[in-house]
C-alpha cells in the first residue's frame, strides 16, 4: 500500500503565439481545481475509462478575476497535494490524466457551473520511494507544470511497496539474514513470506506463501512474460540446441479477471470485461458511488447506491458527458425546423421561425395559400399569415403580374453571385457557403452539422455508465 502524490506548480498560458484568453473575467470570476486519474500499466485508454489505480480531486483554488486588458497570467492554484492512495502493489508503470477544471462563480442561474478547461495525459515509469519527478504538459495553448512521486505507507517498502518492515526485535541489529529497512534504519525487513522462488521484481504477496504477479508477468512464480515462454522441446525446423519461443500460457489462463469479469485476449495482453459496479485492469476495483458526488452542473446521480452498482449521471439540458462535465451547444443539434433560427437562452432553447411557420420548433406550416392565385405560372408559398407568390422567371410583384429581373432582389446570401436561368435564378456561392441561396456555411471539415444527440446524452447511449 502507498500513496501517489501530485503537486501542481503552475497552470497558465504556454509559450509561443496564441495565448489563451483568461478563463475568468470581472463579469464571471472563477477558480480552478484539478482532478487526477491513475491507471496501471502503459495502456492507451479513453479518458472516460475507469481510474483503476485511483483518482483524486483537489481543493478549490482562490477566486480569480481577470484584470481588463491584461494577458492571462498563471492562474492561482489550490493549496496542497493531490493524494491518490493505492491499496495493492505500486505497478511501476502507470498512465495518468490530469484535468484542470474551472468553477464559474458568476450569478448565473443555478449557482456555480463547472467546465473542463484542459486535460493532459501521459504514461510513465516510476519506482515507489524515489524522488519527486518533474513534468510539463501542454493542452492546447495551456501549460501545466507539476511534480509527482509514489511513496509506500509503512510497513511497506521497496519500489513496488511490496516488502514489509517491522520494528527491530533487538535494539542493535536485525535478525539473521534480514537487512535494515532503508530509509527506516531503525526497522528491519520482515521475513520473506512469499512463495519460495517468487520473482522479487515481478511478483509480490500479501499473504504468506502466495505469489501475485505484476502486470505483464505470469506463471506460478511470476517469471514468465505474458504471451511468451521458453520452450524446452524443439518445434518444426528448430533444433534443441537453439531452443525456441512458443506461446506461453494464454493471458486468460486461470481467468485473471476478478469479481465475475470475463477475459479476452488482446495482441499484447488481455482485457477484462467487468460486471456492473467493478472496473480496473482485473475488475478488482469497486465503483465510485453516488455518495462521492460524481455529477457536475446539476446532474442527478442515478443508481450507484453502493460500490457494487455503477452510477449514471442524468444531465440537465445543455450538459453531457459521463459526469455532465461538458457544456453542449444545443443549437448545434439544429432543433429548429423549416429554417428557423435557433437561440440558446441558457434556461431554454427558442426558435425564431421564418414567415409561414410556427410552433416551438417551427414545425407547424401555416396554410396561407387557400383560395389564392398567382399569375404567370407563379406558385403560392405559405408565409407568416399572408400568402406570397414565388414567381416564374421574368415575373415579380405580389401576384407575379409585373415583369422582373430575378436577380434584382440580390437573393444570393454571403456574397454569392446571381445568374438568371430558364428554370429560375441560380446562385454561385462564395467559398465557404452552400445551399440554393448560399445560406448555409460549410463546416471546416467539409460536412454540414447533423443532429448528434439530444442534450445531456452521448450519441446512441442515453444512459452512460462510468
Amino acid at each position: 500500500a502507498g500513496v501517489f502524490e501530485l503537486q501542481i506548480h503552475s497552470f497558465g498560458p504556454g509559450p509561443g503565439p496564441g495565448a489563451p484568453r483568461s478563463p475568468c473575467s470581472a463579469r464571471l470570476p472563477c477558480r480552478l481545481f484539478f482532478r487526477v486519474c491513475l491507471k496501471p500499466g502503459l495502456s492507451e485508454e479513453a479518458a472516460e475509462s475507469p481510474c483503476a489505480l485511483g483518482a483524486a480531486l483537489s481543493a478549490r483554488g482562490p477566486v480569480y478575476t481577470e484584470q481588463p486588458g491584461a494577458p492571462a497570467p498563471d492562474l492561482p492554484l489550490p493549496d496542497g497535494l493531490l493524494q491518490v492512495p493505492f491499496r495493492d502493489a505500486w505497478p511501476g508503470t502507470f498512465s495518468f490524466i490530469i484535468e484542470t477544471w474551472r468553477e464559474e462563480l458568476g450569478d448565473q442561474i443555478g449557482g456555480p457551473a463547472w467546465s473542463l478547461l484542459a486535460r493532459v495525459a501521459g504514461r510513465r515509469r516510476l519506482a515507489a520511494g524515489g524522488p519527486w519527478a518533474r513534468d510539463i504538459q501542454r493542452a492546447g495553448a495551456w501549460e501545466l507544470r507539476f511534480s509527482y512521486r509514489a511513496r509506500c505507507e509503512p510497513p511497506a517498502v521497496g519500489t513496488a511497496c511490496t516488502r514489509l518492515c517491522r520494528p527491530r526485535s533487538a535494539p542493535s541489529r536485525c535478525g539473521p539474514g534480514l537487512r535494515p529497512c532503508a530509509p527506516l534504519e531503525d526497522e528491519c525487513e520482515a521475513p520473506l513470506v512469499c512463495r519460495a522462488g517468487c520473482s522479487p521484481e515481478h511478483g509480490f504477496c500479501e499473504q504468506p506463501g502466495e505469489c501475485r504477479c505484476l502486470e505483464g508477468w505470469t506463471g506460478p512464480l511470476c517469471t514468465v512474460p505474458v504471451s511468451t515462454s521458453s520452450c524446452l522441446s524443439p518445434r518444426g525446423p528448430s533444433s534443441a540446441t537453439t531452443g525456441c519461443l512458443v506461446p506461453g500460457p494464454g493471458p486468460c489462463d486461470g481467468n485473471p479477471c476478478a469479481n465475475g469479469g470475463s477475459c479476452s485476449e488482446t495482441p499484447r495482453s488481455f482485457e477484462c470485461t467487468c460486471p456492473r459496479g467493478f472496473y480496473g485492469l482485473r475488475c478488482e476495483v469497486s465503483g465510485v458511488t453516488c455518495a462521492d458526488g460524481p455529477c457536475f452542473n446539476g446532474g442527478l446521480c442515478v443508481g450507484g447506491a453502493d460500490p457494487d452498482s455503477a452510477y449514471i449521471c442524468h444531465c440537465p439540458p445543455g450538459f453531457q458527458g459521463s459526469n455532465c462535465e461538458k457544456r453542449v451547444d444545443r443549437c448545434s443539434l439544429q432543433p429548429c425546423r423549416n429554417g428557423g433560427l435557433c437561440l440558446d437562452l441558457g434556461h431554454a432553447l427558442r426558435c425564431r421561425c421564418r414567415a409561414g411557420f410556427a410552433g416551438p420548433r417551427c414545425e407547424h406550416d401555416l396554410d396561407d395559400c387557400a383560395g389564392r392565385a398567382c399569375a404567370n405560372g407563379g406558385t403560392c408559398v405559405e408565409g407568416g399569415g399572408a400568402h406570397r407568390c414565388s414567381c416564374a422567371l421574368g415575373f415579380g410583384g405580389r401576384d407575379c403580374r409585373e415583369r422582373a429581373d430575378p436577380c434584382a432582389a440580390r437573393p444570393c446570401a454571403h456574397g454569392g453571385r446571381c445568374y438568371a436561368h430558364f428554370s429560375g435564378l441560380v446562385c454561385a456561392c462564395a467559398p465557404g457557403y452552400m445551399g440554393a441561396r448560399c445560406e448555409f456555411p460549410v463546416h471546416p471539415d467539409g460536412a454540414s452539422a447533423l443532429p448528434a444527440a439530444p442534450p445531456g446524452l452521448r450519441p446512441g447511449d442515453p444512459q452512460r455508465y462510468l
Epitope: 442561474i109 443555478g110 449557482g111 456555480p112 453516488c290 455518495a291 462521492d292 458526488g293 455529477c295 457536475f296 452542473n297 446539476g298 442527478l300 446521480c301 442515478v302 443508481g303 447506491a305 442524468h314 440537465p316 439540458p317 445543455g318 432543433p335 441558457g346 434556461h347 431554454a348 432553447l349 416551438p360 420548433r361 444527440a453 439530444p454 445531456g456 446524452l457 442515453p462 444512459q463
Partner: antibody, heavy 118, light 108 residues
Framework: QVQLQESGPGLVKPSETLSLTCTVS????????WSWIRQPPGKGLEWISY???????NYNPSLKSRVTISVDTSKNQFSLKLSSVTAADTAVYYC????????????WGQGTLVTVSS | EIVLTQSPGTLSLSPGERATLSCRAS???????LAWYQQKPGQAPRHLIY???SRATGIPDRFSGSGSGTDFILTISRLEPEDFAVYYC?????????FGGGTKVEIK
C-alpha cells in the same frame, strides 16, 4: 409564463390503472425534464418519476414496478400510468417542470385529486 | 436513498418574528444540491431556494438558505402574514429525489 395542467379521472377503482396527462403550454416540452409528484391528504410530497423528450426516464424505486411515464412532443404532453392501485395511492397528483440547472421543480400544475375507492 | 428530516414539525411564531427551519440529510449532499419549497393549503408547492442558498426568481430577500453537507437551514428573517405555510426541503443530488417531511409555520 409556462403553465401545466393535469387531467384525468378523479376516481379510480382498486386494482385498476390510474392514468393522468399533463399538458404544457407556453413552452416546448423538448426543453426540459418533466416530472410527477404526489401528496396523500395531510401528508408530505413524494416524487414519482420524470422523463426527458429523448426517452430518458427515472422512477422512484418504491413505485417503479407499477409506474409508466411517457411523453408526446407533438401534443406537448406527458403522461403517468400507475397500475394495481390501492387506497394508499389516493393523493393529489402534481405534474412539474424540472429546471435546467438541477433536478428540482420550478413550475407546478395546480394538482388533481385522485381517489382510489370502489 | 437520502432521507431528509425536517425539524421542528411545527413552528408557532408571530408576524415580524424570525423563523429558522432545519433540514438534515442522512448522508452528505454533494455541491449543496438542495431546494426549499413553500406550500399553502389547497395550492401547489412554490419553489423558493435552490443550491441550498440561491433564491429563485421573484422570491423576497427575507427568505435565505444556508448550510452544506448534511445540515441545511431555511431562514425567514421577518415573518409576513403570507409566509405562514408548510415548508419542504428536497435533495437533487442522488436518485430517488426525496423531500423532507415538512415544517408547518403557524401563527402563534
Amino acid at each position: 409564463q409556462v403553465q401545466l395542467q393535469e387531467s384525468g379521472p378523479g376516481l379510480v377503482k382498486p386494482s385498476e390503472t390510474l392514468s393522468l396527462t399533463c399538458t404544457v403550454s407556453s413552452d416546448s416540452i423538448s426543453n426540459y425534464y418533466w416530472s410527477w409528484i404526489r401528496q396523500p391528504p395531510g401528508k408530505g410530497l413524494e416524487w414519482i418519476s420524470y422523463i426527458y423528450y429523448s426517452g430518458i426516464t427515472n422512477y422512484n424505486p418504491s413505485l417503479k414496478s407499477r409506474v409508466t411515464i411517457s411523453v408526446d412532443t407533438s401534443k406537448n404532453q406527458f403522461s403517468l400510468k400507475l397500475s394495481s392501485v390501492t387506497a394508499a395511492d389516493t393523493a393529489v397528483y402534481y405534474c412539474a417542470r424540472i429546471t435546467v440547472t438541477g433536478f428540482y421543480f420550478d413550475y407546478w400544475g395546480q394538482g388533481t385529486l385522485v381517489t382510489v375507492s370502489s | 436513498e437520502i432521507v431528509l428530516t425536517q425539524s421542528p414539525g411545527t413552528l408557532s411564531l408571530s408576524p415580524g418574528e424570525r423563523a429558522t427551519l432545519s433540514c438534515r440529510a442522512s448522508q452528505s449532499i454533494s455541491r449543496s444540491y438542495l431546494a426549499w419549497y413553500q406550500q399553502k393549503p389547497g395550492q401547489a408547492p412554490r419553489h423558493l431556494i435552490y443550491g441550498a442558498s440561491s433564491r429563485a426568481t421573484g422570491i423576497p430577500d427575507r427568505f435565505s438558505g444556508s448550510g452544506s453537507g448534511t445540515d441545511f437551514i431555511l431562514t425567514i428573517s421577518r415573518l409576513e402574514p403570507e409566509d405562514f405555510a408548510v415548508y419542504y426541503c428536497q435533495q437533487y443530488d442522488t436518485s430517488p429525489l426525496t423531500f423532507g417531511g415538512g415544517t408547518k409555520v403557524e401563527i402563534k
